[in-house]
Interface confidence: low
């Protein structure tokens, strides 16, 4: 009779993470008598996966009933596959011996590849806001994928970025891999509405990459420009002075009026107007009773934006041409700055 052969018909098997792998194995003869064992890997360090005779293998089930006398099908199923299960599996026939069974013949092996999708890329930006013309770094991370081959691209508003560095870890063989990339982005004043996108392509995604995004509105600070102007006289003894705060982001802004260095009024930007580029404009105005002043008045609009050091713009108000009204003790009238807006 022809000598027993152990046949593993599948050179390779591809399984999605979380699923069940079927590893096929048949013997060509019932002789010699003895059990089958499955191993991952070859040589002295091989790992026992299933032993027909003894042991507890909760993830392994046999395809057919190995207790049947004439059974020659030794295929197994391994449940809940993870990338850690990847490797070459050998079906090995043992000959009954005393005291121990003796290895008789091995199958050619079946390589189990596990495909695991990368996690959704997570993009994170700098901890603190930065102003236009500054370069900021964004990081992108994705984990748990297998095989190792992966591609990562960065985009800003659909335009591909080139200034980035990417690492896939670990460098050597592993059950699954992670990717980490850092991109440098130069901010412009128009970036309030901009997006940075990290795109990850992997064989398991069938050509449709995963994307992670970060909004530059979380990263950018556009400082305001200030303009203080004197409006035509409302009444004979009143002058209207406006402070236009333009093109700022984010909205958090506090404005203080100073008359000759003394605080006249402080207010917080509330009813702002939004520009097309996402920045804001705001206007505050102050009614100055010139009859209360003997000399020229230095009016200062001081703005503290998003917790940054204050910026200011001053305007010299000439009062010498105005007749003095006796008995007036109000230097500035507290007016709501939000009722009117020139934008």
């Amino acid at each position: 009779e022809e000598e027993l052969q152990v046949i593993q018909p599948d050179k390779s098997v591809l399984v999605a993470a979380g699923e069940t792998a079927t590893l096929r194995c048949t013997a060509t003869s019932l002789i010699p008598v003895g059990p089958i064992q499955w191993f991952r890997g070859a040589g002295p360090g091989r790992e026992l996966i299933y032993n027909q005779k003894e042991g507890h293998f909760p993830r392994v089930t046999t395809v057919s009933d190995l207790t049947k006398r004439n059974n020659m099908d030794f295929s197994i199923r391994i449940g809940n596959i993870t990338p850690a299960d990847a490797g070459t599996y050998y079906c090995v026939k043992f000959r009954k011996g005393s005291p121990d069974d003796v290895e008789f013949k091995s199958g050619a092996g079946t390589e189990l590849s596990v495909r695991a999708k990368p996690s959704a890329p997570v993009v994170s930006g700098p901890a603190a806001r930065a102003t236009p013309q500054h370069t900021v770094s964004f990081t992108c991370e994705s984990h748990g994928f297998s095989p190792r081959d992966i591609t990562l691209k960065w985009f800003k508003n659909g335009n591909e970025l080139s200034d980035f560095q990417t690492n896939v870890d670990p460098v050597g063989e592993s059950v699954s891999y992670s990717i980490h990339s850092t991109a440098k982005v130069v901010l412009t004043r128009e970036d309030v509405h901009s997006q940075v996108i990290c795109e990850v392509a992997h064989v398991t995604l069938q050509g449709d990459p995963l994307r992670g995004t970060a909004n530059l509105s979380e990263t950018i600070r556009v400082p305001p420009t200030l303009e203080v102007t004197q409006q035509p006289v409302r009444a004979e003894n009143q002058v209207n002075v406006t402070c236009q705060v333009r093109k700022f982001y984010p909205q958090r802004l506090q404005l203080t009026w100073l008359e000759n260095g003394n605080v006249s009024r402080t207010e917080t930007a509330s009813t702002v107007t939004e520009n097309k580029d996402g920045t804001y404009n705001w206007m505050s105005w102050l009614l100055v009773n010139v009859s209360a002043h003997r000399d020229d008045v230095k009016l200062t609009c001081q703005v503290e934006h998003d917790g940054q050091p204050a910026v200011s713009k001053s305007h010299d108000l000439k009062v010498s041409a105005h007749p003095k009204e006796q008995g007036s003790n109000t230097a500035a009238e507290n007016t709501g700055s939000n009722e009117r807006n020139i934008y």
Epitope: V15, A16, E19, R115, D149, T151, V203, Q206, G207
Partner: antibody, heavy 119, light 112 residues
Framework: QVQLQQPGAELVRPGSSVKLSCKAS????????MHWVKQRPIQGLEWIGN????????HYNQKFKDKATLTVDKSSSTAYMQLSSLTSEDSAVYYC????????????WGQGTSVTVSS | DVLMTQTPLSLSVSLGDQASISCRSS???????????LEWYLQKPGQSPKLLIY???NRFSGVPDRFSGSGSGTDFTLKISRVEAEDLGVYYC?????????FGGGTKLEIK
């Protein structure tokens, strides 16, 4: 051996829907993508979309986005494609094909289901 | 969508001769991670299509070595070095790099 079994033919009324099946055997169903392809006489082959049975991730050809819905039943290793609001333009042979994700190739094909839309 | 244009539309070849089919894509079909997913399929009369070549030049298991694929970027070729009677049918190229994936219009190979 790998097999994809599809019913031979379906006769359906205009305006109705039909659910085509594709029963897979001989391999681990959840390990490979399943593609669907349309073939009309003289008109060659059109890719409709595909589905990953392990997590029901789908990709569609936009042309078929409102026409076809791809689903799977892992317990029976069966892929389905539902075609809705049928017109004579939908009369065609529809193939399911296994997609091997490492190189995207459709390595095994079903025999196709011939759908005839007629009143 | 990527348009795949095959030439010629039909081809009549004597047994034992070489046949060559061209496929041109309307844009590069190099995938974002470097591979070119260009495939060739043969559909014999009354049968479903069968995979011949994947990733431009790799023969699928069981495909005779008289079939070979070549090309890059947007221009691809399928060659049959010695045509046999069983090779007749319609040959399709297919790109799997950009969704929606698209087939060429097909080339009918006839035996003289």
């Amino acid at each position: 051996q790998v097999q994809l079994q599809q019913p031979g033919a379906e006769l359906v009324r205009p305006g109705s829907s039909v659910k085509l099946s594709c029963k897979a055997s001989g391999y681990t169903f959840t390990s490979y993508w399943m593609h669907w392809v349309k073939q009309r006489p003289i008109q060659g082959l059109e890719w409709i979309g595909n589905i990953d049975p392990s997590d029901s991730d789908t990709h569609y050809n936009q042309k078929f986005k409102d026409k076809a819905t791809l689903t799977v039943d892992k317990s029976s290793s069966t892929a389905y494609m539902q075609l809705s609001s049928l017109t004579s333009e939908d009369s065609a042979v529809y193939y399911c094909a296994r997609g091997y994700s490492k190189y995207y190739a459709m390595d095994y094909w079903g025999q196709g289901t011939s759908v005839t839309v007629s009143s | 969508d990527v348009l795949m244009t095959q030439t010629p539309l039909s081809l009549s070849v004597s047994l034992g001769d070489q046949a060559s089919i061209s496929c041109r894509s309307s844009q590069s079909i190099v995938h974002s991670y470097g591979n070119t997913y260009l495939e060739w399929y043969l559909q014999k009369p009354g049968q479903s299509p069968k995979l011949l070549i994947y990733k431009v030049s790799n023969r699928f298991s069981g495909v005779p070595d008289r079939f070979s694929g070549s090309g890059s970027g947007t221009d691809f070729t399928l060659k049959i070095s010695r045509v046999e009677a069983e090779d007749l049918g319609v040959y399709y190229c297919f790109q799997g790099s950009h969704v929606p994936y698209t087939f060429g219009g097909g080339t009918k190979l006839e035996i003289k």
